[in-house]
């Protein structure tokens, strides 16, 4: 249970500890979710395969003033092998699509539990 | 509301193979992991395997040294436990158990029990 | 393999009084424990899970405590329909484990 398999991605994979964290955040994020998340804020759409983890954590950076992400982008940072700074891009972010905060975490939480299942039991 | 509807109860031969089902239904079967556990009659409980129905990866405890094999069927939403070469120790209620690992953890919900009975 | 070193094996009480039962995992589990109950004849039901949270429809009576190696579940008092046997889980790593299982009798 050390790291994911099967799932190609720029950099490290994170190992099981550190995603079973993330999901956790995620997790308490949508829990707790009172008010719309950052204030309703929208980000670019992600394509959910390899890079995934920068492409995330490049969508999310550009939420500013927003306490309730800042733990995640923190840790999304650790999964990314290059520093990413606000209104960079890349290949994978869907331009033409923006949604809601709370929708990308939700999005990004169901796929990552699929991540954190598959490497389990494979 | 989630259902895990187990087969029913078998009687077997010792060396023989049983084979136990279990149909789910009131969530997306390929969201939760599958566990199977065993009890003994009187005893307790004990892990034997999981899989992860989306891929069919498994997972299983050492003790059936590899007498136990889990498989998932996604277009009938079922799972399946087989336990090979039976011996009159085998003779115990067999349960599914699924969930959310994050949210309510993966033994949430739980079958009926299948008992089968290993006896010549 | 994790152990889980459930204690008591069995207890006596009375309804109303408050009970406690231990679980010790061999090495830290990061509270990733379950408690379940299990009466007669019937499959499990989980309670607790990740250690303290209670899971939906349980009563409030029932509580998850610890981390690390250490895990307690209380409850606060007894129900008549209380009297039932115990088990804890560890599910940090594969081959999850489960306690031996504790059994609440009347007194």
């Known amino acids: 249970l050390t790291c994911l398999g099967g799932f190609a991605s720029p950099g490290p994979v994170p190992p099981s500890t550190a995603l079973r964290e993330l999901i956790e955040e995620l997790v308490n994020i949508t829990q707790n979710q009172k008010a719309p998340l950052c204030n309703g804020s929208m980000v670019w759409s992600i394509n959910l395969t390899a890079g995934m983890y920068c492409a995330a954590l490049e969508s999310l950076i550009n939420v500013s003033g927003c306490s309730a992400i800042e733990k995640t982008q923190r840790m999304l940072s650790g999964f990314c092998p290059h520093k990413v700074s606000a209104g960079q891009f890349s290949s994978l972010h869907v331009r033409d699509t923006k949604i809601e905060v709370a929708q990308f975490v939700k999005d990004l939480l169901l796929h990552l539990k699929k991540l954190f299942r598959e490497g389990q039991f494979n | 509301e989630v259902q895990l509807v187990q087969s029913g109860a078998e009687v077997k031969k010792p060396g023989a193979t049983v084979k136990i089902s279990c149909k789910v239904s009131g969530y997306t079967f390929t969201d939760y992991e599958m566990h199977w556990v065993q009890q003994a009659p009187g005893k307790g409980l004990e892990w034997m395997g999981g899989?992860?129905?989306?891929?069919?990866?498994?997972a299983s405890n050492q003790k059936f040294k590899g007498r136990v094999t889990i498989t998932a069927d996604k277009s009938t939403d079922t799972a399946y436990m087989e336990l090979s070469s039976l011996r009159s120790e085998d003779t115990a209620v067999y349960y599914c158990?699924?969930?959310?690992?994050f949210g309510g953890g993966p033994f949430a919900y739980w079958g009926q029990g299948t008992l089968v009975t290993v006896s010549s | 393999d994790i152990q889980m070193t459930q204690s008591p094996s069995s207890l006596s009480a009375s309804v109303g009084d408050r009970v406690t039962i231990t679980c010790k995992a061999s090495q830290d589990i990061n509270s990733y424990l379950s408690w379940f109950q299990q009466k007669p004849g019937k499959a499990p039901k989980s309670l607790i899970y990740?250690?303290?949270r209670l899971v939906d429809g349980v009563p409030s009576r029932f509580s998850g405590s610890g981390s690390g190696q250490d895990y307690t579940l209380t409850i606060s008092s007894l129900d008549p329909e209380d009297f039932a046997t115990y088990y804890c889980?560890?599910?940090?790593?594969?081959?999850?484990?489960f306690g031996g299982g504790t059994k609440v009798e009347i007194k």
């Open positions: 889980l560890q599910y940090d790593e594969f081959p999850y484990t």
């Open positions: 158990a699924t969930g959310d690992y």
């Open positions: 899989i992860d129905p989306e891929t069919g990866g498994t």
């Open positions: 990740r250690a303290n």
